[in-house]
């Protein structure tokens, strides 16, 4: 029913710049939050959770022009080599006592592109 769309398989980024990771969701159902992670499995790193936590380098991006989906994209500022990896937007279904992972996007691999040229 719900689709998680991450259109870019690969995103080349530059150290010091801002990276935009796109994710659109076709339905709010099942009810529950969308979180961003880097990597998969139990060792994955939480990148953004709007409801709780402090993520000073992350801001949300909202494209309101699309009638048929919702935008859950994020921007990560001040990129460093430590930020490379594959990023996933993940839909959770509200549950008790804990939310349950429902569906993940296919992932976007963030890799370093060419270094900025000297002025």
């Amino acid at each position: 029913e719900l689709q998680m769309i991450q259109p870019e398989k690969l995103l080349l980024v530059t150290v010091g710049k801002t990276a935009t990771l796109h994710c659109t969701v076709t339905s709010l159902l099942p009810v529950g939050p969308v979180l961003w992670f880097r990597g998969v499995g139990p060792g994955r790193e939480l990148i953004y959770n709007q409801k709780e936590g402090h993520f000073p380098r992350v801001t949300t991006v909202s494209d309101l022009t699309k009638r048929n989906n919702m935008d859950f994209s994020i921007r990560i500022s001040s990129i460093t080599p430590a930020d490379v990896g594959t990023y996933y937007c993940v839909k959770f279904r509200k549950g008790s006592p804990e939310n349950v992972e429902f569906k993940s996007g296919p992932g976007t691999e963030m890799a370093l592109g060419a270094k900025p040229s000297a002025p």
């Epitope: 949300t60 991006v61 309101l64």
Partner: antibody, heavy 118, light 112 residues
């Protein structure tokens, strides 16, 4: 042209049951989240139930949970609301409404009136 | 539950003037920068009709004299200029990921 046509309303005694139906046409019913919203003069608009496009997930407010059951038949482009243990406070106009994204209510039917009274 | 408080409850505005309706939510209805607040128009004997979705987006076919603004907890519906056919009751509605979804109490707009 999008059409949502409700039926099944009527007069019922407290504790009784009713089954509301909503026939949909003019859009891809199986792609839409569907809901019922009711309206009373005293309480205004109140969300009553929602079902996901494939019918897997249903949601209800506490006021009807355990008494109302929402289902759908995508092959028949139809939505159903089974209402049991009806109370006087369930008296309202019941609207069937579509939600492409499970967010805003895009289209509404004309409504069917449910009266619960002894 | 997220409570939506609309004000005023009723509003009388001269034809051609601006009508402004406020909707305040008891907590934020924003998700990832999108405000899940919507506005509907209801005329007597008719079902509600979607005017504005996600705070500021004009639904297809709705005249551009209707506009919406706001974020987080404070939202506004503006009709400018008001036309005779705009006499109706207007409702705000939030559909954040916190159930239950709720509606405001409505604002009745009349001609002065």
């Amino acid at each position: 042209e999008v059409q949502l046509v409700e039926s099944g309303g009527g007069l019922v005694k407290p504790g009784g049951s009713l089954r509301l139906s909503c026939a949909a046409s003019g859009f891809t019913f199986s792609s839409y989240v569907m809901s019922w919203v009711r309206q009373t003069p005293g309480k205004g608009l109140e969300w009553v139930a929602t079902i996901s496009s494939g019918g897997t997930y249903t949601y209800y407010p506490d006021s009807v949970k355990g008494r109302f059951t929402l289902s759908r038949d995508n092959a028949k482009n139809s939505l159903y609301l089974q209402m049991n243990s009806l109370r006087a406070e369930d008296t309202a106009v019941y609207y069937c409404a579509s939600q492409l994204t499970g967010s805003e209510f895009d289209y509404w039917g004309q409504g069917t009136t449910v009266t619960v009274s002894s | 539950d997220i409570v939506l408080t609309q004000s005023p409850a009723s509003l009388a505005v001269s034809l051609g003037e601006r009508a402004t309706i406020s909707c305040r939510a008891s907590e934020s209805v924003d998700l990832y920068g999108t405000s899940f607040m919507h506005w509907y128009q209801q005329k007597p004997g008719q079902p509600p009709k979607l005017l504005i979705y996600r705070a500021s987006n004009l639904e297809s076919g709705v005249p551009d004299r209707f506009s919406g603004s706001g974020s987080r907890t404070d939202f506004t519906l503006t009709i400018n200029p008001l036309q005779a056919e705009d006499v109706a009751t207007y409702y705000c509605h939030q559909s954040s990921d916190e159930l239950p979804w709720t509606f405001g109490g409505g604002t009745k707009v009349e001609i002065k």
